[in-house]
Interface confidence: low
């Protein structure tokens, strides 16, 4: 459960817009704030992950709830509405010309979404234009059953993409994390996210970010110079949401990128990341798919050392132990390695400067028929004080022109059994990955070498 938070979420559109949506640019939100406050929330946060098939960890290793299970469970709870923001959709094998039994979980998810529409539960989808999965028919199938779909032209608006990945269910439950609506995210790609149950105040705050996409998905939409007041957030890094998650005193807030899609009161994603890094006293452990202290997609490429500097400063000035786990797969850009080596070169144990970088290689095994898979797609960071779960890779474009969201959670230790805080759970997941045989030091990684599991 939590403390009541500012209830402006209910003002995104006039009160008389029906739940089944009007034809305007906003979705109706239910339940209304007065009803929400009638009964207490009982917030619960569950870390969720996908472990690719045939990626065994050591016996007894801990794990989070499987993502596919969590998604199906979340849809089972839906009674009124499901709002999904996702870069692209590809829930069926044929979308990418693959016939593989591991796509069945994605197909079950698509089936579940169709059933929801049949039960008069409304589904609203904000997706990216441009998008990756051009052949996917998922959204046509769902639109034919009444789903509302908006393709948000981020390419035109900010020269980026809609890269966010989150759900808001019934204005009460949330999924957010690294996974797109892709069957590979459930069985072939390593992902990490969080599901938050029974947390209307946080859900309705994240809904405001969904609404920013929704209004930009109408024809000829333009970015507002100033977002209207009803998009503003009262939950941010200066005033995080405070409450109890399973009885544990918790603060939490959502950040967003790019800044152009941060209405008043919304903490920009980059600022959230820097704040979490800046508050660390003991350690910063980060697991990201890509790490480039540059731009990635704009030309000419620019140097962008913001996150790199923050990690270096934490290690050098405060003696914070920095560990960076970066993904390494068949599609990894080898130009990343000099930056990783440069960061690690700062390490100097004699001067109490500790910076370690490893790459995480998911063995391809007999799954080579599946493109853009067998990779660690997670984007999270944990310190002794906070957990950060994001949707963005670490290079400039993700924070300046592409949409993303972050979740920053801090739980008070001591009020619950050891190991129960979110940051402690996330630390344990990171350390499981870091100490596994799939995490390889940079010494063993020649520049430009393919990220192929040497087993």
């Amino acid at each position: 459960w939590q403390v009541r938070c500012p209830p402006t979420w209910g003002q995104v559109q006039p009160r008389d817009v029906p739940r089944s949506w009007g034809h305007g640019s906003s979705l109706a939100l239910e339940p209304l704030e007065a009803e929400v406050r009638k009964q207490r929330d009982s917030c619960q946060l569950v870390l969720v992950e996908s472990i690719p098939q045939d990626l065994p960890f050591a016996a007894g290793s801990l794990s989070a709830q499987p993502l596919g299970q969590a998604w199906l469970q979340l849809l089972d709870t839906a009674q009124e509405s499901v709002h999904v923001a996702s870069y692209y959709w590809s829930l069926t094998g044929p979308d990418i010309g693959v016939n593989d039994s591991s796509s069945q979980l994605g197909e079950a998810l698509l089936q579940k979404l169709q059933q929801l529409l049949g039960r008069n539960i409304s589904l609203a989808v904000a997706t990216s234009s441009p998008t990756l999965a051009r052949k996917s028919t998922d959204l046509q199938v769902l639109a034919a059953r009444g789903a509302q779909v908006r393709r948000v032209p981020m390419g035109r608006l900010t020269r980026g993409v809609l890269h966010s990945k989150f759900w808001v269910v019934d204005g009460r439950h949330i999924y957010m994390g690294s996974a797109n609506m892709d069957w590979r995210s459930l069985t072939q790609v390593k992902e990490l996210g969080a599901v938050i149950y029974n947390c209307s105040h946080l859900a309705q705050d994240l809904e405001k970010t969904f609404q920013t996409y929704w209004v930009l998905g109408v024809p000829k939409a333009v970015l507002p110079k100033t977002w209207p007041q009803n998009f503003s957030s009262h939950i941010n890094r200066f005033q995080p949401f405070q409450g109890l998650f399973d009885g544990v005193p918790t603060t939490a807030y959502f950040s967003a990128s790019p800044p152009a899609l941060c209405p008043q009161g919304r903490t920009p994603d980059l600022e959230a990341l820097l704040a979490v890094m800046g508050s660390a006293q003991e350690f910063i452990y980060a697991s990201v798919m890509e790490y480039f202290p540059t731009t990635r997609f704009s030309h000419p490429r620019r140097y962008w050392p913001v996150l790199d500097n923050a990690l270096r400063a934490a290690a050098f000035s405060k003696g914070v132990r920095v560990r960076l786990l970066v993904s390494c797969g068949l599609n990894t850009d080898p130009t990343m390695f000099p930056y990783l080596r440069s960061l690690q070169a700062l390490s100097n144990p004699a001067a109490n400067v500790s910076v370690d970088v490893k790459v995480f290689i998911v063995p391809v095994g007999n799954h080579s028929n599946i493109p853009f898979s067998r990779v660690n797609h997670s984007k999270f960071m944990v310190t002794e004080k906070a957990a950060y779960i994001g949707t963005s890779n670490w290079s400039e474009d993700y924070f300046s022109s592409t949409t993303g969201v972050g979740l920053v959670v801090t739980q008070s230790p001591g009020a619950q059994p050891a190991g129960a805080t979110v940051q402690e759970q996330l630390r344990q997941l990171f350390e499981r990955d870091w100490s596994s045989r799939y995490a390889v030091g940079l010494d063993g990684q020649a520049p430009g070498q393919d990220c192929v599991w040497q087993g």
Partner: antibody, heavy 118, light 107 residues
Framework: QVQLQQPGAELVKPGTSVKMSCKAS????????MHWVKQRPGQGLEWIGD????????NYNEKFKSKATLTVDTSSSTAYMQLSSLTSEDSAVYYC???????????WGQGTSVTVSS | DIQMTQTTSSLSASLGDRVTISCRAS??????LNWYQQKPDGTVKLLIY???RLHSGVPSRFSGSGSGTDYSLTISNLEQEDIATYFC?????????FGGGTKLEIK
């Protein structure tokens, strides 16, 4: 430190209205709910309603819906409660209180004593 | 509305005593129970929120416990300044409601 300042007393005639104030200081006014509570002489406490200054959202106890109107002036960090069609039943002390962690009313004003008398 | 009942309307105790004041809700309020102290001059202070959490600045001789529908406030070592009326309040379901109060007096 958090302070809620209320005028000490109001003497009003039956059938009229009264608007009492509660000036907040020592915290961000727009970030906390403000509650109003009634206490009749020698009696217990009754919750009237609350208002969120950041959005003017209000909640009322059904019993006071047609009696009380809650408003705020964020520029002066002041919350107001107007009571209408006053009768002797409305003679009471009225407190404002800040809604804090887990909705507990963590700081209270000194109360305004309203006497309805002709 | 949820009814809050403080069965003891007044209580006499000696300085140094351990005093317990009880409060019952008409339905389960999931620990959303707060305790307030009202001094004879009308000043009201929050003592305990969420059943057992001490508000800042409140002496540690005050403690709270309970669950479901039954809750209590305990003063472990009664002092002169504790002479007041104590109210419980549920914060589980709107409208918030208070108990009738327990007046604590010195024997």
């Amino acid at each position: 430190q958090v302070q809620l300042q209320q005028p000490g007393a109001e003497l009003v005639k039956p059938g009229t209205s009264v608007k009492m104030s509660c000036k907040a200081s020592g915290y961000t006014f727009t970030s906390y709910w403000m509650h109003w509570v009634k206490q009749r002489p020698g009696q217990g406490l009754e919750w009237i309603g609350d208002i969120y200054p950041g959005s003017d959202s209000t909640n009322y106890n059904e019993k006071f819906k047609s009696k009380a109107t809650l408003t705020v002036d964020t520029s002066s960090s002041t919350a107001y409660m107007q009571l209408s069609s006053l009768t002797s039943e409305d003679s009471a002390v009225y407190y404002c209180a800040r809604g804090g962690w887990l909705d507990a009313m963590d700081y209270w004003g000194q109360g305004t004593s309203v006497t309805v008398s002709s | 509305d949820i009814q809050m009942t403080q069965t003891t309307s007044s209580l006499s105790a000696s300085l140094g005593d351990r005093v317990t004041i009880s409060c019952r809700a008409s339905q389960d309020i999931s620990n959303y129970l707060n305790w307030y102290q009202q001094k004879p001059d009308g000043t009201v202070k929050l003592l305990i929120y969420y059943t057992s959490r001490l508000h800042s600045g409140v002496p540690s001789r005050f403690s709270g416990s309970g669950s479901g529908t039954d809750y209590s406030l305990t003063i472990s070592n009664l002092e002169q300044e504790d002479i007041a009326t104590y109210f419980c309040q549920q914060g589980n379901t709107l409208p918030w409601t208070f108990g009738g109060g327990t007046k604590l007096e010195i024997k």
